[in-house]
Interface confidence: medium
Protein backbone atom coordinates (compact mmCIF):
# COMPACT_ATOMS: atom_id res chain seq x y z
CA UNK A 1 0.00 0.00 0.00
CA UNK A 2 1.29 3.50 -1.01
CA UNK A 3 0.57 4.92 2.52
CA UNK A 4 2.49 2.59 4.71
CA UNK A 5 3.46 4.35 8.01
CA UNK A 6 2.21 7.48 7.09
CA UNK A 7 0.56 9.55 10.06
CA UNK A 8 -1.93 12.07 9.37
CA UNK A 9 -1.13 15.70 10.18
CA UNK A 10 -2.62 17.11 12.74
CA UNK A 11 -2.62 20.11 15.14
CA UNK A 12 -4.00 22.22 11.66
CA UNK A 13 -3.40 26.06 12.85
CA UNK A 14 -3.94 29.42 10.86
CA UNK A 15 -2.02 31.82 11.80
CA UNK A 16 -2.80 35.52 10.06
CA UNK A 17 -1.57 38.82 10.82
CA UNK A 18 -2.69 41.42 8.39
CA UNK A 19 -3.52 38.50 5.75
CA UNK A 20 -0.21 37.08 6.21
CA UNK A 21 -1.19 33.87 6.39
CA UNK A 22 0.55 30.66 7.22
CA UNK A 23 -0.95 26.99 7.78
CA UNK A 24 1.08 24.92 10.68
CA UNK A 25 0.87 21.33 12.11
CA UNK A 26 2.13 18.52 13.76
CA UNK A 27 4.33 16.34 13.77
CA UNK A 28 7.28 16.70 12.32
CA UNK A 29 7.51 14.01 9.47
CA UNK A 30 9.73 11.34 9.28
CA UNK A 31 8.64 8.47 7.06
CA UNK A 32 6.57 11.02 4.61
CA UNK A 33 6.58 14.73 3.42
CA UNK A 34 3.44 16.68 3.02
CA UNK A 35 1.58 18.75 0.57
CA UNK A 36 -1.29 20.90 0.91
CA UNK A 37 -3.86 21.58 -0.92
CA UNK A 38 -6.24 24.88 -0.51
CA UNK A 39 -9.65 25.68 -2.61
CA UNK A 40 -12.07 28.11 -2.10
CA UNK A 41 -15.65 26.73 -1.32
CA UNK A 42 -17.09 26.23 -4.87
CA UNK A 43 -12.96 26.35 -6.31
CA UNK A 44 -10.77 23.46 -7.50
CA UNK A 45 -8.49 22.21 -4.93
CA UNK A 46 -4.68 23.77 -5.58
CA UNK A 47 -1.49 21.96 -4.40
CA UNK A 48 1.36 24.06 -2.67
CA UNK A 49 4.05 23.56 -0.90
CA UNK A 50 4.75 20.41 -2.93
CA UNK A 51 6.33 17.30 -0.70
CA UNK A 52 7.80 19.37 1.88
CA UNK A 53 9.45 18.45 5.28
CA UNK A 54 8.30 21.69 6.90
CA UNK A 55 5.37 21.81 9.27
CA UNK A 56 4.18 25.60 7.99
CA UNK A 57 2.82 26.41 4.40
CA UNK A 58 2.61 30.24 3.24
CA UNK A 59 -0.79 30.56 1.78
CA UNK A 60 -0.56 33.88 1.68
CA UNK A 61 -0.43 34.19 -2.10
CA UNK A 62 -3.64 31.95 -2.49
CA UNK A 63 -6.31 33.92 -0.10
CA UNK A 64 -4.81 37.48 -0.89
CA UNK A 65 -6.85 36.46 -4.21
CA UNK A 66 -9.99 37.10 -2.23
CA UNK A 67 -9.93 38.32 1.32
CA UNK A 68 -13.79 38.22 1.70
CA UNK A 69 -13.85 34.44 0.54
CA UNK A 70 -13.91 31.17 2.87
CA UNK A 71 -10.71 29.15 1.85
CA UNK A 72 -10.42 25.13 2.75
CA UNK A 73 -7.35 23.90 3.19
CA UNK A 74 -5.88 20.16 3.77
CA UNK A 75 -2.58 18.69 4.24
CA UNK A 76 -1.85 15.30 2.84
CA UNK A 77 1.12 12.81 4.40
CA UNK A 78 2.71 11.25 1.31
CA UNK A 79 5.27 8.54 2.01
CA UNK A 80 8.72 8.95 0.62
CA UNK A 81 8.49 6.50 -2.10
CA UNK A 82 6.20 8.28 -3.85
CA UNK A 83 7.33 11.87 -3.54
CA UNK A 84 10.88 10.76 -5.09
CA UNK A 85 9.30 9.89 -8.71
CA UNK A 86 9.44 13.69 -9.43
CA UNK A 87 5.79 13.97 -10.29
CA UNK A 88 3.99 16.33 -8.84
CA UNK A 89 1.00 14.35 -7.86
CA UNK A 90 -0.40 12.99 -4.64
CA UNK A 91 -1.15 9.91 -5.29
CA UNK A 92 0.23 6.39 -4.75
CA UNK A 93 1.74 3.42 -7.36
CA UNK A 94 -1.96 2.04 -6.90
CA UNK A 95 -3.60 5.49 -7.16
CA UNK A 96 -5.03 5.64 -3.91
CA UNK A 97 -5.40 9.04 -1.80
CA UNK A 98 -2.80 9.44 1.11
CA UNK A 99 -3.87 9.76 4.19
CA UNK A 100 -5.12 13.66 4.77
CA UNK A 101 -6.40 16.37 7.28
CA UNK A 102 -8.40 18.47 7.01
CA UNK A 103 -7.95 22.51 8.43
CA UNK A 104 -11.29 24.73 9.74
CA UNK A 105 -12.53 27.24 7.15
CA UNK A 106 -10.84 30.19 6.89
CA UNK A 107 -12.37 33.55 5.98
CA UNK A 108 -9.54 35.84 5.97
CA UNK A 109 -11.84 39.33 6.55
CA UNK A 110 -12.92 37.52 9.45
CA UNK A 111 -10.03 35.69 10.96
CA UNK A 112 -6.50 37.49 10.17
CA UNK A 113 -5.57 39.02 13.47
CA UNK A 114 -4.55 42.63 13.02
CA UNK A 115 -1.01 43.48 13.48
CA UNK A 116 0.47 45.78 16.18
CA UNK A 117 -0.31 49.34 14.90
CA UNK A 118 2.34 52.11 14.91
CA UNK A 119 2.16 55.54 15.95
CA UNK A 120 3.84 57.61 12.62
CA UNK A 121 3.61 61.06 14.31
CA UNK A 122 1.65 64.00 16.31
CA UNK A 123 1.35 67.76 16.28
CA UNK A 124 0.86 69.55 18.58
CA UNK A 125 -0.26 73.03 17.82
CA UNK A 126 -1.75 75.18 20.70
CA UNK A 127 -3.76 73.27 22.79
CA UNK A 128 -4.43 70.57 20.64
CA UNK A 129 -2.35 67.58 19.37
CA UNK A 130 -3.23 65.74 15.78
CA UNK A 131 -2.21 61.98 16.16
CA UNK A 132 -1.60 60.37 13.05
CA UNK A 133 -1.42 56.18 12.98
CA UNK A 134 0.67 54.46 10.36
CA UNK A 135 -1.66 52.79 7.60
CA UNK A 136 0.21 49.66 6.97
CA UNK A 137 0.58 47.88 4.13
CA UNK A 138 -0.63 44.37 3.37
CA UNK A 139 -0.33 41.51 0.53
CA UNK A 140 -3.39 42.26 -0.78
CA UNK A 141 -3.24 43.86 -4.03
CA UNK A 142 -5.13 45.57 -6.30
CA UNK A 143 -4.14 46.94 -9.62
CA UNK A 144 -0.71 45.81 -8.79
CA UNK A 145 -0.60 47.46 -5.70
CA UNK A 146 -0.23 46.45 -2.43
CA UNK A 147 -3.28 47.92 -0.04
CA UNK A 148 -3.14 48.85 2.92
CA UNK A 149 -5.02 48.04 6.08
CA UNK A 150 -8.04 51.13 6.19
CA UNK A 151 -7.96 50.14 2.00
CA UNK A 152 -9.19 46.51 2.84
CA UNK A 153 -11.19 47.20 5.85
CA UNK A 154 -12.36 50.77 5.30
CA UNK A 155 -14.70 51.80 7.98
CA UNK A 156 -15.04 48.63 9.86
CA UNK A 157 -11.44 49.36 11.08
CA UNK A 158 -11.49 52.13 13.54
CA UNK A 159 -8.59 52.64 15.97
CA UNK A 160 -8.50 53.71 19.84
CA UNK A 161 -6.10 56.18 21.21
CA UNK A 162 -4.63 56.03 24.76
CA UNK A 163 -3.48 58.83 26.36
CA UNK A 164 -2.10 60.42 29.84
CA UNK A 165 0.01 62.91 31.13
CA UNK A 166 3.62 61.88 31.57
CA UNK A 167 3.26 63.04 35.16
CA UNK A 168 0.00 61.36 35.71
CA UNK A 169 -1.67 57.73 35.30
CA UNK A 170 -4.91 58.41 34.66
CA UNK A 171 -5.44 57.73 30.70
CA UNK A 172 -8.20 59.00 28.66
CA UNK A 173 -8.90 57.44 25.19
CA UNK A 174 -10.93 58.38 22.38
CA UNK A 175 -11.80 56.83 18.95
CA UNK A 176 -11.55 57.39 15.10
CA UNK A 177 -12.54 55.41 12.22
CA UNK A 178 -10.03 57.42 9.92
CA UNK A 179 -6.19 57.09 11.18
CA UNK A 180 -5.80 60.53 12.47
CA UNK A 181 -7.18 61.97 16.10
CA UNK A 182 -7.51 65.04 17.18
CA UNK A 183 -7.60 66.02 20.66
CA UNK A 184 -7.72 67.98 23.65
CA UNK A 185 -4.33 68.57 25.12
CA UNK A 186 -3.13 70.93 28.62
CA UNK A 187 -0.66 73.35 27.20
CA UNK A 188 2.67 73.17 28.73
CA UNK A 189 1.76 69.57 30.23
CA UNK A 190 3.85 66.70 28.39
CA UNK A 191 1.47 63.76 27.37
CA UNK A 192 1.85 60.19 26.35
CA UNK A 193 0.06 57.91 23.42
CA UNK A 194 -0.66 54.33 22.53
CA UNK A 195 -3.43 53.27 19.83
CA UNK A 196 -4.82 50.01 19.10
CA UNK A 197 -6.62 48.79 15.84
CA UNK A 198 -10.23 47.37 16.30
CA UNK A 199 -12.78 46.03 14.23
CA UNK A 200 -16.00 46.44 16.20
CA UNK A 201 -17.62 44.01 13.83
CA UNK A 202 -15.73 41.02 14.80
CA UNK A 203 -16.76 38.29 17.38
CA UNK A 204 -12.92 37.84 17.72
CA UNK A 205 -9.81 38.77 17.07
CA UNK A 206 -11.51 42.00 17.29
CA UNK A 207 -8.19 44.26 18.60
CA UNK A 208 -4.77 44.38 18.05
CA UNK A 209 -1.90 44.71 20.70
CA UNK A 210 -1.52 48.10 21.78
CA UNK A 211 1.13 50.16 19.76
CA UNK A 212 4.39 51.45 21.55
CA UNK A 213 3.95 53.88 23.43
CA UNK A 214 5.35 57.25 22.24
CA UNK A 215 5.56 60.76 24.76
CA UNK A 216 5.39 64.00 23.82
CA UNK A 217 9.25 65.44 24.15
CA UNK A 218 10.72 62.43 22.05
CA UNK A 219 11.63 62.56 18.05
CA UNK A 220 8.23 61.86 16.76
CA UNK A 221 6.30 64.94 18.04
CA UNK A 222 6.15 68.30 15.90
CA UNK A 223 5.40 71.52 18.29
CA UNK A 224 3.95 74.60 17.30
CA UNK A 225 2.78 77.13 18.95
CA UNK B 1 31.55 24.10 11.73
CA UNK B 2 28.05 25.54 13.36
CA UNK B 3 28.40 27.68 16.67
CA UNK B 4 25.73 28.83 19.11
CA UNK B 5 26.62 31.30 21.82
CA UNK B 6 24.22 32.86 24.62
CA UNK B 7 24.25 36.40 25.76
CA UNK B 8 22.03 38.38 27.87
CA UNK B 9 22.15 39.21 31.62
CA UNK B 10 23.18 36.98 34.26
CA UNK B 11 20.99 38.64 37.54
CA UNK B 12 17.50 39.44 36.75
CA UNK B 13 15.31 40.77 39.53
CA UNK B 14 11.55 39.05 40.62
CA UNK B 15 8.99 40.20 38.21
CA UNK B 16 10.93 41.14 35.16
CA UNK B 17 11.39 39.60 31.99
CA UNK B 18 14.55 37.36 30.97
CA UNK B 19 15.47 38.05 28.08
CA UNK B 20 18.36 36.37 26.20
CA UNK B 21 19.70 36.10 22.75
CA UNK B 22 21.26 32.96 21.04
CA UNK B 23 24.15 33.87 17.51
CA UNK B 24 24.74 31.66 15.10
CA UNK B 25 28.30 31.55 13.63
CA UNK B 26 29.91 28.85 10.94
CA UNK B 27 26.12 28.42 9.11
CA UNK B 28 22.85 30.30 8.42
CA UNK B 29 20.01 30.05 10.91
CA UNK B 30 17.98 29.98 7.15
CA UNK B 31 18.94 26.40 6.80
CA UNK B 32 16.10 24.41 7.57
CA UNK B 33 17.00 23.47 11.09
CA UNK B 34 14.84 24.26 14.61
CA UNK B 35 16.48 26.80 17.29
CA UNK B 36 15.52 25.75 20.86
CA UNK B 37 16.55 27.11 23.96
CA UNK B 38 16.77 24.55 27.03
CA UNK B 39 17.12 25.34 30.67
CA UNK B 40 18.47 23.39 33.57
CA UNK B 41 17.58 24.11 37.13
CA UNK B 42 20.90 24.02 39.71
CA UNK B 43 21.63 20.46 40.26
CA UNK B 44 18.77 19.32 38.31
CA UNK B 45 17.72 17.60 34.79
CA UNK B 46 17.00 19.23 31.76
CA UNK B 47 13.33 21.05 30.39
CA UNK B 48 12.88 22.39 27.20
CA UNK B 49 11.36 25.91 26.79
CA UNK B 50 10.50 25.75 23.21
CA UNK B 51 11.93 25.93 19.52
CA UNK B 52 11.28 28.46 16.58
CA UNK B 53 11.66 27.65 12.79
CA UNK B 54 13.56 30.42 10.69
CA UNK B 55 10.46 31.36 9.66
CA UNK B 56 9.18 32.21 12.65
CA UNK B 57 7.11 29.43 13.45
CA UNK B 58 6.95 27.79 17.14
CA UNK B 59 6.21 25.62 19.72
CA UNK B 60 6.66 25.97 23.53
CA UNK B 61 6.30 23.84 26.41
CA UNK B 62 2.69 24.37 27.73
CA UNK B 63 4.00 24.86 30.75
CA UNK B 64 5.46 27.72 29.94
CA UNK B 65 3.86 28.90 26.95
CA UNK B 66 1.77 32.13 28.68
CA UNK B 67 5.42 33.61 29.35
CA UNK B 68 7.59 32.49 26.77
CA UNK B 69 8.09 34.18 23.86
CA UNK B 70 10.85 33.25 21.12
CA UNK B 71 12.01 35.10 18.17
CA UNK B 72 13.93 34.52 15.63
CA UNK B 73 16.35 37.37 13.39
CA UNK B 74 17.82 36.24 9.95
CA UNK B 75 19.35 39.45 9.29
CA UNK B 76 21.70 39.30 12.37
CA UNK B 77 21.79 34.97 12.27
CA UNK B 78 20.29 34.92 15.87
CA UNK B 79 17.27 33.79 17.85
CA UNK B 80 16.18 34.94 21.06
CA UNK B 81 14.39 34.05 24.24
CA UNK B 82 11.99 36.23 26.63
CA UNK B 83 10.39 34.71 29.44
CA UNK B 84 7.88 37.50 31.63
CA UNK B 85 7.11 37.61 35.15
CA UNK B 86 10.26 35.38 36.32
CA UNK B 87 10.48 34.35 39.96
CA UNK B 88 13.62 32.44 41.72
CA UNK B 89 11.91 29.08 40.19
CA UNK B 90 13.33 30.40 36.69
CA UNK B 91 16.75 30.46 38.25
CA UNK B 92 19.01 28.11 35.53
CA UNK B 93 21.30 27.88 33.28
CA UNK B 94 19.50 28.32 29.95
CA UNK B 95 21.13 26.95 26.70
CA UNK B 96 20.44 27.05 23.02
CA UNK B 97 20.58 24.60 20.26
CA UNK B 98 19.91 23.48 16.84
CA UNK B 99 17.35 20.98 16.62
CA UNK B 100 18.65 19.12 13.18
CA UNK B 101 16.26 17.27 10.95
CA UNK B 102 18.45 14.61 9.14
CA UNK B 103 17.66 12.42 5.98
CA UNK B 104 18.49 9.05 6.19
CA UNK B 105 17.53 5.81 4.53
CA UNK B 106 13.80 7.33 3.44
CA UNK B 107 13.20 8.36 6.48
CA UNK B 108 13.78 11.70 8.84
CA UNK B 109 15.56 11.85 12.29
CA UNK B 110 15.43 14.72 14.68
CA UNK B 111 18.13 15.47 17.55
CA UNK B 112 19.89 18.77 19.00
CA UNK B 113 23.17 17.61 17.39
CA UNK B 114 25.17 22.10 18.45
CA UNK B 115 24.50 23.45 22.00
CA UNK B 116 25.63 26.66 23.00
CA UNK B 117 27.94 26.59 26.40
CA UNK B 118 25.31 27.79 28.16
CA UNK B 119 24.41 31.19 30.47
CA UNK B 120 23.84 30.93 34.19
CA UNK B 121 20.74 33.43 35.15
CA UNK B 122 19.95 34.03 38.55
CA UNK B 123 16.53 35.84 39.34
CA UNK B 124 17.15 37.46 43.07
CA UNK B 125 16.39 41.17 43.99
CA UNK C 1 3.21 14.94 27.83
CA UNK C 2 5.14 11.84 27.20
CA UNK C 3 7.34 11.22 30.42
CA UNK C 4 10.43 9.62 30.32
CA UNK C 5 12.04 7.40 33.42
CA UNK C 6 15.78 6.55 33.67
CA UNK C 7 16.84 4.22 35.97
CA UNK C 8 18.66 3.19 37.61
CA UNK C 9 19.10 7.10 39.17
CA UNK C 10 22.82 6.69 39.99
CA UNK C 11 25.09 3.38 38.59
CA UNK C 12 28.42 2.77 40.45
CA UNK C 13 30.49 0.97 38.25
CA UNK C 14 34.73 0.64 37.75
CA UNK C 15 36.35 1.59 34.67
CA UNK C 16 35.95 -1.65 32.08
CA UNK C 17 32.65 -2.53 33.16
CA UNK C 18 29.81 -2.94 30.76
CA UNK C 19 26.74 0.12 31.73
CA UNK C 20 23.10 -0.66 30.77
CA UNK C 21 21.21 2.45 31.27
CA UNK C 22 17.04 2.37 30.55
CA UNK C 23 14.52 4.86 29.43
CA UNK C 24 10.92 4.27 29.60
CA UNK C 25 8.01 6.22 27.61
CA UNK C 26 5.03 6.80 29.28
CA UNK C 27 3.61 6.38 25.76
CA UNK C 28 4.99 4.99 22.69
CA UNK C 29 7.47 7.13 20.86
CA UNK C 30 8.64 6.77 17.61
CA UNK C 31 12.46 5.94 17.71
CA UNK C 32 13.28 8.65 15.20
CA UNK C 33 12.65 11.15 17.22
CA UNK C 34 14.21 9.67 20.41
CA UNK C 35 18.05 11.21 21.39
CA UNK C 36 20.71 10.07 24.20
CA UNK C 37 23.03 12.72 25.52
CA UNK C 38 26.15 13.09 27.82
CA UNK C 39 26.53 16.00 30.18
CA UNK C 40 29.57 15.97 32.08
CA UNK C 41 29.69 18.95 34.96
CA UNK C 42 29.72 22.65 34.02
CA UNK C 43 29.29 21.48 30.00
CA UNK C 44 26.50 21.42 27.47
CA UNK C 45 25.00 18.24 26.87
CA UNK C 46 26.55 16.05 24.01
CA UNK C 47 24.88 14.31 21.57
CA UNK C 48 25.44 10.51 21.71
CA UNK C 49 22.72 8.58 20.05
CA UNK C 50 20.04 9.81 17.35
CA UNK C 51 16.97 7.53 16.12
CA UNK C 52 17.62 5.49 19.15
CA UNK C 53 20.05 3.39 17.76
CA UNK C 54 22.47 5.79 15.06
CA UNK C 55 25.69 6.71 16.80
CA UNK C 56 26.23 10.45 16.10
CA UNK C 57 29.37 11.60 14.49
CA UNK C 58 32.59 11.44 16.45
CA UNK C 59 31.17 9.06 19.03
CA UNK C 60 33.22 5.81 20.06
CA UNK C 61 31.50 2.22 18.95
CA UNK C 62 31.55 1.28 22.83
CA UNK C 63 28.41 3.65 22.65
CA UNK C 64 25.20 2.01 21.64
CA UNK C 65 21.69 2.60 21.32
CA UNK C 66 18.72 0.34 21.11
CA UNK C 67 14.77 -0.32 21.89
CA UNK C 68 11.78 0.97 20.36
CA UNK C 69 7.99 2.25 21.05
CA UNK C 70 8.60 3.20 24.92
CA UNK C 71 11.30 1.00 26.06
CA UNK C 72 14.69 2.55 25.10
CA UNK C 73 18.59 1.17 26.19
CA UNK C 74 21.59 3.09 26.36
CA UNK C 75 24.76 0.69 27.01
CA UNK C 76 28.58 1.55 27.14
CA UNK C 77 30.34 -1.32 26.74
CA UNK C 78 33.32 -0.76 28.26
CA UNK C 79 33.39 2.05 30.52
CA UNK C 80 36.59 4.39 29.88
CA UNK C 81 37.70 7.07 32.90
CA UNK C 82 36.26 9.89 30.55
CA UNK C 83 32.68 8.30 30.60
CA UNK C 84 32.02 8.94 34.12
CA UNK C 85 28.70 11.38 33.84
CA UNK C 86 25.21 12.13 33.66
CA UNK C 87 23.02 10.74 30.75
CA UNK C 88 19.69 11.61 29.30
CA UNK C 89 17.31 10.41 26.67
CA UNK C 90 15.36 13.02 24.91
CA UNK C 91 12.23 12.49 22.95
CA UNK C 92 11.08 15.31 20.16
CA UNK C 93 8.19 13.85 18.09
CA UNK C 94 5.58 15.38 20.64
CA UNK C 95 5.50 18.81 22.52
CA UNK C 96 6.55 18.90 24.86
CA UNK C 97 9.83 17.90 24.11
CA UNK C 98 10.91 16.03 27.02
CA UNK C 99 13.82 14.71 29.09
CA UNK C 100 14.11 11.72 31.07
CA UNK C 101 15.43 12.80 34.85
CA UNK C 102 18.90 11.35 33.72
CA UNK C 103 21.01 8.48 34.91
CA UNK C 104 24.46 9.25 36.58
CA UNK C 105 27.36 7.12 35.69
CA UNK C 106 29.82 6.99 38.51
CA UNK C 107 33.02 5.50 39.49
CA UNK C 108 32.46 3.20 42.22
Known amino acids: SGTTNTVAAYNLTWKSTNFKTILEWEPKPVNQVYTVQISTKSGDWKSKCFYTTDTECDLTDEIVKDVKQTYLARVFSVPWRNSTHGKETLFGTHGEEPPFTNARKFLPYRDTKLGQPTIQSFEQVGTKVNVTVEDERTLVRRNNTFLSLRDVFGKDLIYTLYYWKSSSSGKKTAKTNTNEFLIDVDKGENYCFSVQAVIPSRTVNRKSTDSPVECMGQEKGEFRE | QVQLQESGPGLVKPSQTLSLTCTVSGGSISSGQYWSWIRQHPGKGLEWIGEIYYSGSTRYNPSLKSRVTISVDTSKNQFSLKLSSVTAADTAVYYCARDTPYYYDGGYYYYMDVWGKGTTVTVSS | EIVLTQSPGTLSLSPGERATLSCRAS???????LAWYQQKPGQAPRLLIYGASSRATGIPDRFSGSGSGTDFTLTISRLEPEDFAVYYCQQVGVVPYTFGGGTKVEIK
Open chain 3, 27 to 33: QSVSSSY
